[in-house]
C-alpha cells in the first residue's frame, strides 16, 4: 500500500499556503483527485509529488494515491481543507446525473471543517427541500440525497453558517433519470403468416416500457399503417398495442410487416413476413440425398422437411420393401416443428440389419392433397470369399466367389508354404482380376462376383489365396493343395455376423 506524506488523514491550510503531498510506493504511483488547475505534479523515482505554492479554496478535496501495478489495488488518501473565510464551499460539479433509487452525491466540499455544525441543503432561491427528502452530509464529500426520485430533479445549493449568516454555494443541478434499461420491449405476432386469398388474418404489434414516453408503429413494406392504439399499464410497465385485422386477405396485403418502437434510449424493431397464396400447398424436401448407402450394423436418420398450409391432416413413414413386410416402429419416427408452416420429420434406423435395406417413403396429407418422398437405402457389406477347385474344359481351375457391396475387387496370390494367409515375404506371384464375372447384382442386395484362376499343375508346398476388398473391408480364402486332395482355409477373422 502506498504511503502519503504528511501522514495525516486530513490537512487544514490557509489560502496562499504552499502544500506538498508526497506519495511513495513499491512501484510507480498515481495521484487521483478532482482535476484542478492549481496543482503541479512531478515524479521523483518511486514517489509522486503533488504540490502548489499558492493553495486556494479550489484545492479542497480528497487526494488518493494508488499503485497501478499492485494486484491488491491498495490506496492511501488525504483530505485537504483550504479554509477561505470568503469561500466556505468548493463545488466540484455543475450537474449531477443519477438514476432513480441511486444515492445522489452533491459535491459541495466544505473548505473549513469547523463549519460542519451549521450546514444545510436547500433548493435554489431559498426554497425548502421537498418532503421525504432523506439526505446526509460529509465534509469530505458533500450532501448525499439517498434513493433519489425523479421528482427530486431540482437545482440545489449548499448552505453554511458563517458569523451568524448563511453563505450559499453556487447551484448544482440534480438530474434523476428514470431507469430505462433500453428501447421498449417488442412483440410482433405471429412471427410468420400464410393465408389463402379470401381468408381472415390478424397481426398484433405491442411494445412496453417502464416509462410512458415511447412511440410504437406498424409498417407494411415501409409504409406506416394508421391503426388505433390501445394503451395499458400493468406490472409497472406501460403497454401500447396495435392490432391489424384483415377480414379477407388479398395479394396486396402480402409482404413485410415491421413493428417499431422508440424512446430516448434508441429504437427496436422486429419484422415478420405475410404470404398470401392462391390455394393450399404441401411441399416435401430433404437436405439428404434420396439414395443412401450405409454400412450394415450402422445407423441412419432419414429427414424430411415439410412446408404446408393449411396444417397437416396426416403423415406416416412406410417401408416399401423388398425384403419384408415389416413397417418402421412409430417410436423411431420423430416430428419437430421449426415454425408454424415448416416441420421436420425424422425416421431413426439404428443398427441396420440386412432385411432393412430398401425403399422408405414419407407420406403427408393436407387439404392440398397427398405428397410422398421416397429414400432408397442400400447396405454396404465387406466381402465374403470362398474358393473351390474344379475342372473347366479339362483344365484345373481355382474358382473364387466373392460377395459384398459395393462390388468387390479380386486379387489372387500364390505363396510358398502352407498358410492361412499369404504374407509379403512368402508371395511368389500376384494376379489382379480387373473384370471378375458378376454372378448377381440386384438392387439392395450384395453383388456376387466370380474369378477363375487356371492352374496347370498344383504345387503341393504352396498356398493359393483369393482376396477380395471393397470400401467397407476385405475378405480372403486360402487354398492349400494336398496330395490326398485339396484343403481350403477361410481365415479365422472371416467369422462375420452382421
Amino acid at each position: 500500500i502506498p504511503v502519503i506524506e504528511p501522514s495525516v488523514p486530513e490537512l487544514v491550510v490557509k489560502p496562499g499556503a504552499t502544500v506538498t503531498l508526497r506519495c511513495v510506493g513499491n512501484g510507480s504511483v498515481e495521484w487521483d483527485g478532482p482535476p484542478s488547475p492549481h496543482w503541479t505534479l512531478y515524479s521523483d523515482g518511486s514517489s509522486s509529488i503533488l504540490s502548489t505554492n499558492n493553495a486556494t479554496f479550489q484545492n479542497t478535496g480528497t487526494y488518493r494515491c494508488t499503485e497501478p501495478g499492485d494486484p491488491l489495488g491498495g490506496s492511501a488518501a488525504i483530505h485537504l481543507y483550504v479554509k477561505d473565510p470568503a469561500r466556505p464551499w468548493n463545488v466540484l460539479a455543475q450537474e449531477v446525473v443519477v438514476f432513480e433509487d441511486q444515492d445522489a452525491l452533491l459535491p459541495c466540499l466544505l473548505t473549513d471543517p469547523v463549519l460542519e455544525a451549521g450546514v444545510s441543503l436547500v433548493r435554489v432561491r431559498g426554497r425548502p427541500l421537498m418532503r421525504h427528502t432523506n439526505y446526509s452530509f460529509s465534509p469530505w464529500h458533500g450532501f448525499t440525497i439517498h434513493r433519489a426520485k425523479f421528482i427530486q430533479s431540482q437545482d440545489y445549493q449548499c448552505s453554511a453558517l458563517m458569523g451568524g449568516r448563511k453563505v450559499m454555494s453556487i447551484s448544482i443541478r440534480l438530474k434523476v433519470q428514470k431507469v430505462i434499461p433500453g428501447p421498449p420491449a417488442l412483440t410482433l405476432v405471429p412471427a410468420e403468416l400464410v393465408r389463402i386469398r379470401g381468408e381472415a388474418a390478424q397481426i398484433v404489434c405491442s411494445a412496453s416500457s417502464v416509462d410512458v414516453n415511447f412511440d410504437v408503429f406498424l409498417q407494411h413494406n415501409n409504409t406506416k399503417l394508421a391503426i388505433p392504439q390501445q394503451s395499458d399499464f400493468h406490472n409497472n410497465r406501460y403497454q401500447k398495442v396495435l392490432t391489424l385485422n384483415l377480414d379477407q386477405v388479398d395479394f396486396q396485403h402480402a409482404g413485410n410487416y415491421s413493428c417499431v418502437a422508440s424512446n430516448v434510449q434508441g429504437k427496436h424493431s422486429t419484422s415478420m413476413f405475410f404470404r398470401v397464396v392462391e390455394s393450399a400447398y404441401l411441399n416435401l424436401s430433404s437436405e439428404q440425398n434420396l439414395i443412401q448407402e450405409v454400412t450394415v450394423g450402422e445407423g441412419l436418420n432419414l429427414k424430411v422437411m415439410v412446408e404446408a398450409y393449411p396444417g397437416l391432416q396426416g403423415f406416416n413413414w412406410t417401408y416399401l420393401g423388398p425384403f419384408s413386410d415389416h413397417q418402421p416402429e412409430p417410436k423411431l419416427a420423430n416430428a419437430t416443428t421449426k415454425d408454424t408452416y415448416r416441420h421436420t420429420f425424422t425416421l431413426s434406423l439404428p443398427r441396420l440389419k440386412p432385411s432393412e435395406a430398401g425403399r422408405y417413403s414419407f407420406l403427408a396429407r393436407n387439404p392440398g392433397g397427398w405428397r410422398a418422398l421416397t429414400f432408397e437405402l442400400t447396405l454396404r457389406y465387406p466381402p465374403e470369399v470362398s474358393v473351390i477347385w474344379t475342372f473347366i474344359n479339362g483344365s484345373g481351375t481355382l474358382l473364387c466367389a466373392a460377395s459384398g457391396y459395393p462390388q468387390p475387387n479380386v486379387t489372387w496370390l500364390q505363396c510358398s508354404g502352407h498358410t492361412d494367409r499369404c504374407d509379403e515375404a512368402q508371395v511368389l506371384q500376384v494376379w489382379d482380376d480387373p473384370y471378375p464375372e458378376v454372378l448377381s447384382q440386384e438392387p439392395f442386395h450384395k453383388v456376387t462376383v466370380q474369378s477363375l484362376l487356371t492352374v496347370e499343375t498344383l504345387e503341393h508346398n504352396q498356398t493359393y489365396e483369393c482376396r477380395a476388398h471393397n470400401s467397407v473391408g476385405s475378405g480372403s480364402w486360402a487354398f492349400i493343395p494336398i496330395s490326398a486332395g485339396a484343403h481350403t482355409h477361410p481365415p479365422d477373422e472371416f467369422l462375420f455376423t452382421p
Epitope: 482535476p35 503541479t40 490506496s75 460539479a93
Partner: antibody, heavy 117, light 110 residues
C-alpha cells in the same frame, strides 16, 4: 493496464440525440474522473466535459445546454448524450481518464460519429 | 477558433532539434500547468508531457516541455521519422473550468 472502448451508432440524423458509451476495462471506474473529447476531421481537439463516478459533471460552456453525461459503475461504463445535433457535431469522439492536473493519461481508440440525413 | 496559438506546421531533418510553441493567456497558461499530446496519424492522442515538464513512463527523454509566462513550448531533440505527428498543447483554462486544446502543430520529418 486501463483500457477504454467507445461504442454507439456511427450515424445520427440532424436534430436527433447522439449517444455514446465508454466501457472501462483493466481497472475500476470508481474514484476517477472520466472525460469526453471530440475531434472533427482534419481539425483540433475539443474537451466536451467530465464526469466523476458519483455522477458529478462539468461541461464545456459552449456545449453545456446540449450535453448530458451519466455513469454506470456496475457495468464499468460512462456515457455521453449530445442533443439537437447538426453537421458541425460530426467528429471522432474519444473517451479518456482525466488525471489530477487535467492530463488525459488513458484514451479510447475513438468512435466516428457522422451527422447526416 | 482556439484560445491558444500554435504554429500550424513545423519540420526538421532526422537528428535535428525542433521546438513547438504554444501561446495563451493569463486564464490558462499564465496561471496553470500545461500538458502536451502527440497524435500519430489515424490514432488517438497520447500524453507526452504533463505539469509543464513531466514525462509519463515510456516517453523518451528526447521530449521535454517548458513554460514561461503565458507561453509554453515542447522541444524534440534527435528528431526521428516516427516523431512525425500532430502535437497539441493543453493547459487548464479557468474560464472553461477544464482543459483547453491548442489548434495543433503538424510536425514533418524531412
Amino acid at each position: 493496464q486501463v483500457q477504454l472502448q467507445e461504442s454507439g451508432p456511427g450515424l445520427v440524423k440532424p436534430s436527433e440525440t447522439l449517444s455514446l458509451t465508454c466501457t472501462v476495462s483493466g481497472g475500476s471506474i470508481s474514484s476517477n474522473y472520466w472525460s469526453w473529447i471530440r475531434q472533427p476531421a482534419g481539425k483540433g481537439l475539443e474537451w466536451i466535459g467530465r464526469i466523476y463516478t458519483s455522477g458529478s459533471t462539468k461541461y464545456n460552456p459552449s456545449l453545456k445546454s446540449r450535453v448530458t453525461m451519466s455513469v454506470d459503475t456496475s457495468k464499468n461504463q460512462f456515457s455521453l448524450k449530445l442533443s439537437s445535433v447538426t453537421a458541425a457535431d460530426t467528429a471522432v469522439y474519444y473517451c479518456a481518464r482525466e488525471g489530477i492536473v487535467g492530463a488525459f493519461h488513458y484514451w479510447g481508440q475513438g468512435a466516428l460519429v457522422t451527422v447526416s440525413s | 477558433q482556439s484560445v491558444l496559438t500554435q504554429p500550424p506546421s513545423a519540420s526538421g531533418t532526422p537528428g535535428q532539434r525542433v521546438t513547438i510553441s504554444c501561446s495563451g493567456s493569463s486564464s490558462n497558461i499564465g496561471s496553470n500547468t500545461v500538458n502536451w499530446y502527440q497524435q500519430l496519424p489515424g490514432t488517438a492522442p497520447k500524453l507526452l508531457i504533463y505539469s509543464n515538464n513531466q514525462r509519463p513512463s515510456g516517453v523518451p527523454d528526447r521530449f521535454s516541455g517548458s513554460k514561461s509566462g503565458t507561453s509554453a513550448s515542447l522541444a524534440i531533440s534527435g528528431l526521428q521519422s516516427e516523431d512525425e505527428a500532430d502535437y497539441y498543447c493543453a493547459p487548464w483554462d479557468d474560464s472553461l473550468n477544464g482543459v483547453v486544446f491548442g489548434g495543433g502543430t503538424k510536425l514533418t520529418v524531412l
